[in-house]
């Protein structure tokens, strides 16, 4: 789903059931530690020397919802995610490097501790390079492993 041109409000489709208080995980992995802002995430990535994984999504997007379920239920993904600084966002940041080919959701991007956006780590869709679908969990795992191999930075 492309969020560049926002369609009309979709409050009519919102689930009316009472929910537990929303945590920073927003359902992407309640046992994981999530950062609140992009700025905080960049700082933590740099100081901890851990790569940053950023998930852009929307509550009212069926593909965000579907990917969230497989992400949260996949034990390998959840285990590997512990090695990252984690951020999930339901809004766009001002950093254009995080939307090199558009502001669609869901999309997952990685940032090296050197604060380089890993635009080279892509999914399987040529028209939406950073999109992942539920069938793409193996590829996402591979890409997480790629991101853990940190870029060499000159001292």
């Amino acid at each position: 789903r492309d969020t560049t041109v926002k369609p009309g409000a979709k409050k009519d489709t919102k689930d009316s059931r009472p929910k537990l208080p929303q945590t920073l995980s927003r359902g992407w992995g309640d046992q994981l530690i999530w950062t609140q802002t992009y700025e905080e995430a960049l700082y933590k990535s740099k100081t901890s020397n851990k790569p940053l994984m950023i998930i852009h999504h929307l509550d009212e997007c069926p593909h965000s919802q579907a990917l969230k379920k497989v992400f949260a239920e996949n034990k390998e993904i959840q285990k590997l995610a512990e090695q990252f600084v984690l951020l999930n966002l339901v809004y766009e940041t001002t950093d254009k490097h995080l939307s090199p080919d558009g502001q669609y959701v869901p999309r997952i991007m990685f940032v090296d501790p050197s604060l380089t956006v890993r635009a080279d780590i892509t999914g399987r869709y040529s028209n939406r390079l950073y999109a992942y679908e539920p069938a793409d969990t193996a590829l996402l795992l591979d890409n997480m492993k790629k991101a853990l191999k940190l870029l060499k930075t000159e001292l």
């Epitope: 579907a66 239920e73 539920p134």
Partner: antibody, heavy 120, light 107 residues
């Protein structure tokens, strides 16, 4: 193989309530989205909503949100559609349809449907 | 909500002929479109998902194409058993919406 079996349809008076069931088998129930779709006599198809049985998350078509409620019972591998304040225009065949086997949103398997008639 | 406009509404075709049904979305839906076949007094059967992926067990004479707003279902060499109503569905955005249907009749 995958099987979906709807039940609970029948004749109900305007303003009445009905609870439809969709019994499933042949796949991991908790990890596929389940949709409800209806088809008025001689008409096209209309999506009602979906539920993720693993945690009960739902989304509804705004047209029915205030009157219809989806739920799931993991012990019985069944999903339910509770319909309240029924109107004549709710008369239709109601289908449950499973999402993709991998958790994708596309509709992969359909039940045979159950007819709901709202009439006085 | 996203509106899907199917055309034609009705098509009368001779066996072995090629059938083309189009579905136009009111906005970009990427490739999140499915095609279904429904015969009288039966439930719909899924033929195609993600615009061009054939569901297991569906004959290869069925194919789908398109992305963005314009999509096509093609039946190469129509068979008598293909007489049915065909629907498209977008699942890019809530609420999911269906096209109005195309009835294919055998001459």
């Amino acid at each position: 193989q995958v099987q979906l079996l709807e039940s609970g349809g029948g004749l109900v008076k305007p303003g009445g309530s009905l609870r439809l069931s969709c019994a499933t088998s042949g796949y991991v129930f908790s990890r596929s989205w389940m949709n409800w779709i209806r088809q008025a006599p001689g008409q096209g198809l209309e999506w009602i909503g979906w539920i993720y049985p693993g945690d009960g998350d739902t989304n509804y078509n705004g047209k029915v949100k205030d009157r219809f409620t989806l739920s799931a019972d993991k012990a019985k591998n069944s999903v339910y559609l509770q319909m309240n304040s029924l109107r004549a225009e709710d008369t239709a065949v109601y289908f449950c349809a499973r999402g993709g086997y991998d958790g994708s949103p596309w509709l992969s398997y359909w039940g045979q449907g159950t007819l709901v008639t709202v009439s006085s | 909500e996203i509106v899907l406009t199917q055309s034609p509404d009705f098509q009368s075709v001779t066996p072995k002929e090629k059938v083309t049904i189009t579905c136009k979305a009111s906005q970009d839906i990427n490739s999140y479109l499915s095609w279904f076949q429904q015969k009288p007094d039966q439930s719909p059967k899924t033929l195609i998902y993600r615009a061009n992926r054939l569901v297991d067990g569906v004959p290869s004479r069925f194919s789908g194409s398109g992305s963005g707003q314009d999509f096509t279902l093609t039946i190469n060499s129509l068979e008598a058993e293909d007489a049915a109503t065909y629907y498209c569905l977008q699942y890019d955005e809530f609420p999911f919406t269906f096209g109005g249907g195309t009835k294919v009749e055998i001459k």
